[in-house]
């Protein structure tokens, strides 16, 4: 018996099997499976990409293609040999032993083989074309790489040359820096020596200043003692003169006028020849009671008796009626001279009031009243002012007509509230009014939006707290 079978083996290769009696002939045909599927960018019959991804990749792929080509060539040669060696004998036997219909089978196998061979040949032709194409491209790329390499080599040479130049410059600059460092070290040493000398000098000066300050304090005390001694001596001299001369003697009056030792205000001190600003002792009118005051002998011709001063918040101005009456603080710094003294002084002669103000932006302003006096304690030291001029507002920031003085323990204002309690400090509050130079002291950057600060409304508005204030008086006829 005889039959023909076409099947696929376990590896997926096609095989042709011819069974003829006891003999079986199997033809294993070479497969095209070693060629990549068309999804591959380098598959035969696929469109060739413009250029390989990179040089190394191209070389690798070329080697793969060459291997495939080699394999296919070997297959073909084996197949030819196989056909030549074995088929000749078999064909003779088949012709002798099989019937006509098996010739047809053989023809089919032959045709199939020829078709396979033709397909293989076509594929090989494609691959050869691709390899040539690829090789040409690679050659072009190699040429381009070669040109690029030459350019790079030239650039490297140029850069090397530049680096050498820069190194030379660097060496030169390094040398310069080293020279400069040397000089700098010398200068630093010199400066350190100078600094040490200056520190010694500063230390010496500090001790000198301390000594001078001590001497100043002593001198101030001595000055007061001397004034008192002079005052006592003059009284003794006057007593002696009175005893020696008759009551209508003119000489005693002349001496008294010449040697005035008690001063009711700074204007009298100025006129006596003492024209340096500082602390002086004043005497209450018609009394021997004394009070220390700061005399400003520089501003506007001098002779000013300072009745209030604020500058740094070192003194608490939220004080009682008694304290405002008698005065508090230090005439060298922040202080209130005292309502009783000012009332008595301004009640005897016509005085002018000057108010000097400083804000936190470096501006200064003043208000000058050509007539100022305080009523007595029975009228709550009510303030009277007329004739305003100056730069701190065209309208008076002290309410007109004058208000009574109020303190935290004596409410004499026109508000339902207690302005002194509300706004802090003793002042001539209205309800509560446009000013309060005795308010809470606020430092810079905390001095705005304050109800209870140092206020002068017609210069800086309602919420602004001033940096410094001075209230001073002087006789109108000075």
């Amino acid at each position: 018996y005889s039959n023909f079978r076409k099947s696929v083996d376990s590896t997926g290769r096609r095989q042709y099997q011819v069974q003829n009696g006891p003999c079986s002939y199997t033809f294993l045909l070479p497969e095209t499976d070693s060629c990549r599927s068309s999804s591959s960018p380098y598959m035969s019959n696929a469109v060739q990409r413009d250029a390989p991804l990179d040089y190394d990749d191209s070389v690798q792929r070329l080697q793969v293609l060459e291997n495939i080509l080699e394999n296919n060539t070997q297959w073909l040669m084996k197949l030819e040999n196989y056909i030549q060696d074995n088929m000749k004998k078999e064909m003779v036997e088949i012709q002798q032993n099989v019937v006509q219909n098996q010739t047809a089978v053989m023809i089919e196998i032959g045709t199939s083989l020829l078709n396979q061979t033709a397909a293989q040949t076509r594929k090989l032709t494609d691959v050869e074309a691709q390899v040539l194409n690829q090789t040409t491209r690679l050659e072009l790329q190699l040429l381009q790489h070669s040109i690029s390499t030459n350019k790079l080599e030239k650039q490297i040479l140029d850069q090397t040359s530049e680096i050498n130049k820069l190194q030379n410059k660097n060496s030169f600059l390094e040398q310069k820096v080293l020279d400069m460092e040397g000089k700098h070290s010398e200068q630093l040493q010199s400066m350190k020596e100078q600094k040490d000398e200056l520190q010694v000098l500063v230390s010496k000066q500090s001790s000198v200043i301390d000594e001078l300050e001590k001497k100043l304090v002593t001198a101030t005390v001595n000055n007061s003692l001397l004034q008192k001694q002079q005052h006592d001596l003059m009284e003794t001299v006057n007593s002696l003169l009175t005893m020696m001369s008759s009551p209508n003697s003119k000489s005693s009056v002349a001496i008294r006028k010449e040697e005035q030792t008690t001063f009711r205000d700074c204007a009298e001190i100025f006129k006596s020849g003492l024209t340096t600003s500082g602390i002086y002792t004043l005497t209450f009118p018609n009394s021997t009671e004394e009070i220390k005051a700061y005399c400003d002998m520089d501003v506007g011709g001098g002779g000013w008796t300072v009745i209030q001063h604020r500058e740094d918040g070192s003194v608490d101005f939220q004080r009682t009626w008694k304290e405002y009456k008698e005065g508090f603080g230090s005439p060298l710094g922040e202080y209130w001279l005292g309502n009783e003294f000012v009332s008595q002084l301004t009640g005897q002669h016509r005085y002018v009031l000057k108010i000097q103000l400083k804000d936190w932006e470096g501006n200064e302003a003043h208000s000058l009243y050509d007539h100022f006096y305080l009523a007595g304690e029975e009228s709550n030291y009510r303030i009277h002012l007329t004739g305003l001029t100056g730069t701190a507002g065209k309208i008076s920031s002290i309410s007109q007509p004058g208000s009574d003085f109020s303190t935290k323990d004596s409410d004499n204002d026109k508000c339902i509230c207690k302005c002194s309690q509300m706004l802090s400090g003793g002042w001539w509050f209205d309800a509560c009014g446009p000013s309060n130079l005795n308010g809470q002291y606020y430092p810079q950057k905390q001095n705005t939006n304050k109800f209870n600060g140092i206020k002068w409304y017609y210069w800086k508005g309602s919420g602004y707290s001033l940096k410094a204030t001075t209230m001073m008086i002087r006789p109108a006829d000075f």
Partner: antibody
């Protein structure tokens, strides 16, 4: 009689600015300070700042510092409040009000009718 | 900032009865406290200033008291027209601050 009349309601986008006006009548505009107070839905009243029309002096609540500007035009007796960089939480009724005292920002005796400002994208 | 805390948040009182609203300041504000009444859709209206002084035209059934940190607004005999939200306000120091209000209703 003394009256403060405010401008109408506004709808604004976040990041924009709004300027509300308040026209005073029946009294001397420069004799009293003017304040601005806002009332957000379900929130407390919030004081924003004041202006003294006499000298142009202003004071602001630190919460709004840098975003609020209060101005006054004496010739028209009108105060203005401008709030910039608006956000949704600025949605509120904004009131102008007169202070009883020229020299101090005490209590507020006359109020405008309010201006609703809605901030929405 | 000074915090003004009102209590209660709301209050229901029968007509003719007394209504009492409290306000507590977080620090001493002396007597610098005002009270305002606000009806729906209207601006606030000044009732009391300096803790106890009635503003012009305010009925005498409204009274205020207190000093320092504790303040009270009293409506001695509640009327229908008194239904509103009431706010306290301190002006002792910057910034002036308000309480968050007490709603008064009729029981």
């Amino acid at each position: 009689q003394v009256q403060l009349v405010q401008s109408g309601a506004e709808v604004k986008k976040p990041g924009s600015s709004v300027k509300v006006s308040c026209k005073a009548s029946g009294y001397s505009f420069t004799d009293y300070n003017m304040v601005w107070v806002r009332q957000a839905p379900g929130q407390c009243l919030e004081w924003m700042g004041y202006i003294d029309p006499y000298n142009g002096g202003t004071g602001y609540n630190q919460k709004f510092e840098g975003r609020v500007t209060i101005t006054a035009d004496e010739s028209t007796s009108t105060a203005y409040m401008e709030l910039s960089s608006l956000r949704s939480e600025d949605t509120a009724v904004y009131y102008c009000a007169r202070t009883r005292d020229r020299y101090d920002v005490w209590y507020f005796d006359v109020w405008g009718q309010g201006t609703l400002v809605t901030v929405s994208s | 900032d000074i915090v003004m805390t009102q209590s209660p948040d709301s209050l229901a009182v029968s007509l003719g009865e007394r209504a009492t609203i409290n306000c507590k300041a977080s620090q001493d504000v002396y007597i610098a406290v005002a009270w305002y009444q606000q009806k729906p859709g209207q601006p606030p209206k000044l009732l009391i200033y300096w803790a106890s002084t009635r503003d012009t035209g305010v009925p005498d059934r409204f009274s205020g008291s207190g000093s320092g940190t504790d303040f009270t607004l009293t409506i001695s005999s509640l009327q229908a027209e008194d239904v509103a939200v009431y706010y306290c306000h301190q002006y002792s120091s910057y910034p002036p601050t308000f309480g968050c209000g007490t709603k008064v209703e009729i029981k």
